[in-house]
């Protein structure tokens, strides 16, 4: 914290220019207004101060908005945005999205650090969803930003925003959360053909239950062995051969090479063996012929 | 985004030292530089400055009349050239771009 002293004669800024770089910590604090520093926020950016010099004017400013910044000072802050802590920021009410990428752009580039994080939450928040420009602005800036939220998070995602999402945006989400992704995916697209609609869903189909799997399989749609390879394990175990090699379609030959990997590894227990050699691939520990299969589920579901 | 200062050295008083700093991995023709020092338990203080044009300059009253900034875009550099050097030049000179900090500074040693 630096000591309040007095400003020097013919030292006083009239504005914020490059001249300020030469003041010693003491005489910004002393010559800067906060209030001109508010006002001229937009040219803080173009002057290489130090650090030091940076941390006394963030002072001016927290002295100056004791209650949290305004938006007309938080969208000049540039640079100083980094300067900010989580609890800073907590203060904030951000409502503009342009505030949000003039910030955001200032951390490009970089992981995303707890300042960002507490941004963008407060400006979701304040929103109330997730709406489509500020999926595409945040996911533009961090591709794996839907995959960060927790599936509660994710519910106030609307359908609307889906168009948003590219595939890449979805790699490192996690079952649970393509859980709640899928249904507002399905409802997005729901009025597209059939092709088209299988390219936009198929990011999303790690999420989609057997009965959905069982439709697009009469679409002749030609699911590649990666999507496959993602879909839930018991979404895909009801699946008969025939239905996996309609979805497949020339694909169908990669499960040789996946057979020891979930899901094909535990579907292929669950089916005949006499049904996979249909296949003409040579999978192997299907269930013997003249072997009687009880569903026990279904046996204790009925009693 | 990263500064490298280069061209500190030993130098007696009275004699002429002159600075790069250059930029790697961005332009620097959309920056503003500032040139800064800080001598050992002394606070970092600013020496010049010049703006991204090199239509501006600016100096520490301490060292007006004996430095001098320039920039040279094509060769992504900027440089100071300091004459008459003191003793209380002694310092790590570092430079910066808009944001801080440069990089890892150049020693200077009026002796």
């Known amino acids: 914290e630096v000591e309040k002293t007095a400003c020097p004669s013919g030292k006083k800024a009239r504005e914020i220019d490059e001249s300020l770089i030469f003041y010693k910590k003491w005489e910004l604090e002393a010559c800067v207004d906060a209030a001109l520093l508010a006002t001229q926020m937009d040219r803080v950016n173009a002057i290489p101060f130090t650090y030091e010099q940076l941390d006394v004017l963030k002072h001016k400013l927290d002295e100056l908005y004791p209650q949290g910044y305004p938006e007309s000072v938080i969208q000049h802050l540039g640079y100083l945005f980094l300067k900010m802590s989580p609890e800073d920021i907590r203060k904030w009410n951000v409502t503009s999205l342009e505030t949000l990428k003039a910030l955001l752009e200032v951390n490009k580039g970089h992981e995303m650090s707890p300042q960002v994080a507490t941004l963008i939450d407060r400006f979701v928040k304040g929103r109330g969803q997730l709406d489509k420009d500020t999926l595409d602005t945040l996911t533009a800036f961090y591709p794996g930003y839907l995959c960060s939220l927790s599936p509660e998070e994710l519910s106030s995602v609307p359908p609307s925003s889906i168009w948003a999402v590219r595939p890449q945006d979805l790699d490192t989400c996690d079952p649970r959360q393509l859980d709640v992704l899928y249904p507002k995916a399905r409802l997005a697209f729901q009025n597209m053909n059939g092709s088209e609609y299988f390219v936009k869903i198929q990011s999303f189909l790690g999420g989609a239950p057997t009965e959905d799997l069982k439709a697009l399989s009469q679409q002749n749609v030609s699911m590649d062995l990666a999507t496959f390879m993602k879909l839930r394990t018991d979404a895909v175990l009801p699946l008969t051969v025939a239905e996996v090699q309609k979805l497949l379609g020339p694909h169908v030959e990669g499960l040789k090479a996946e057979e020891r990997h979930r899901p094909v590894r535990d579907w292929i227990l669950r089916q005949r063996q006499d049904d996979l050699d249909t296949l003409g691939l040579g999978l192997q520990g299907g269930i013997p012929n003249g072997y009687l299969v009880l569903d026990l589920s279904m046996q204790e579901a009925l009693s | 985004l990263q500064l490298v200062e280069s061209g500190g050295g030993l130098v007696q008083p009275g004699g002429s030292l002159r600075l790069s700093c250059a930029a790697s991995?961005?332009?620097?023709?959309?920056?503003?530089i500032g040139w800064f020092r800080q001598a050992p338990g002394k606070e970092r203080e600013g020496v010049s400055y010049?703006?991204?044009?090199?239509?501006?300059?600016n100096y520490a009253d301490s060292v007006k009349g004996r430095f001098t900034i320039s920039r040279d875009n094509a060769k992504n550099t900027v440089y100071l050239q300091m004459n008459s050097l003191k003793p209380e030049d002694t310092a790590v000179y570092y430079c910066?771009?808009?944001?801080?900090?440069g990089g890892q500074g150049t020693l200077v040693t009026v002796s």
């Open positions: 910066a771009a808009d944001w801080p900090p």
């Open positions: 010049i703006s991204s044009s090199g239509g501006s300059t």
């Open positions: 991995g961005f332009t620097l023709d959309y920056y503003a």
